[in-house]
Amino acid sequence: FERTRSLQDPCSNCPAGTFCDNNRNQICSPCPPNSFSSAGGQRTCDICRQCKGVFRTRKECSSTSNAECDCTPGFHCLGAGCSMCEQDCKQGQELTKKGCKDCCFGTFNDQKRGICRPWTNCSLDGKSVLVNGTKERDVVCGPSPADLSPGASSVTPPAPAREPGHSPQ
């Protein structure tokens, strides 16, 4: 059936980047400016996505593929295809309806996006806190208290925690 249809349908010969123009006896016309067709046999070209406002163009539209957007500095993409841009916050903060807010005590966020998460509870794994948590960093768990009892093998003291803002990005 498909083969028969393609023999009868002149539009099936129109390649990507063109459309089958009913106003011109179904000849293949190039897509108008700022539009594209990514497959052959199309009766219309799709209008290109415009990256406006907090969006910026990551990939220009061509006659055969849509534009792609990302976000301007200070914002990051959300959702498939960067459908939304969300404001960045600093490490140690999370975005709320009222803007960026510091993480509450006992929580941290080591990224410019996302929410503050609770510090790891070392005792759940039978371990002790080796390095205290901050707004920007989770706690570091060490050996269990039993491992640190007299006679146990010595533990190399941890390196000092890095200052916030100096951690590798």
């Epitope: 400016p33 700022n34 219309t44 799709d46 209008i47 290109c48 996505r49 415009q50 406006k52 406002g53 163009t57 959300l78 959702g79 498939a80 295809g81 459908s83 939304m84």
Partner: antibody, heavy 118, light 112 residues
Framework: QVQLQESGPGLVKPSETLSLTCTVS????????WSWIRQPPGKGLEWMGY???????QYNPSLKSRVTISVDTSKNQFSLKLSSVTAADTAVYYC????????????WGQGTLVTVSS | EIVMTQSPLSLPVTPGEPASISCRSS???????????LDWYLQKPGQSPQLLIY???NRASGVPDRFSGSGSGTDFTLKISRVEAEDVGVYYC?????????FGQGTKLEIK
Amino acid sequence: QVQLQESGPGLVKPSETLSLTCTVSGGSISSYYWSWIRQPPGKGLEWMGYIYYSGSTQYNPSLKSRVTISVDTSKNQFSLKLSSVTAADTAVYYCARDQSGGGSFQHWGQGTLVTVSS
Amino acid sequence: EIVMTQSPLSLPVTPGEPASISCRSSQSLLYSNAYNHLDWYLQKPGQSPQLLIYAGSNRASGVPDRFSGSGSGTDFTLKISRVEAEDVGVYYCMQALQTPPTFGQGTKLEIK
């Protein structure tokens, strides 16, 4: 070619919730933005909001507290809910494919009239 | 929100004659990429609106070349070089620069 079809009750009582569904055929919903636009009888067009297939939404501030748009990619459908309706919400409701998130509505459904009346 | 104002609101035209509709926006629709975020739609009697012109001047694929759009910034014009009977309906301009997109009041084109 892409076709859109609205469906839902044509009559809704005041204070109730209006619910409509738009079914997309001839193409996947998993791309582009998808909008709802309405037109009261004899009047102009009003954009209500859009959804991206990933679920991101944006609404008209004039309706924001009452409108919810959702998507079901498995059924190639997206839906509109408008709560606490009054007679002023009587309109033809259109679904449309939105090329840029609030711009260039290239494909429209045929529209469905929803009357708000007791 | 951006306010769109069309004129005239009613436009009687003789078939074969040209027609022109004006649309003005309350702020510039020209974006930094030299793209005017202005669309024109035609709603024929009893039908859904259909896109005629996007980006101020680009004819949508399949739209007859008697339709043309021009203008930039805040002032835009839709021209029909030779009106045909099938062109009757209400013409709307719409700004697509800011959310929410907003439409003009509409211009009703009728045949004399």
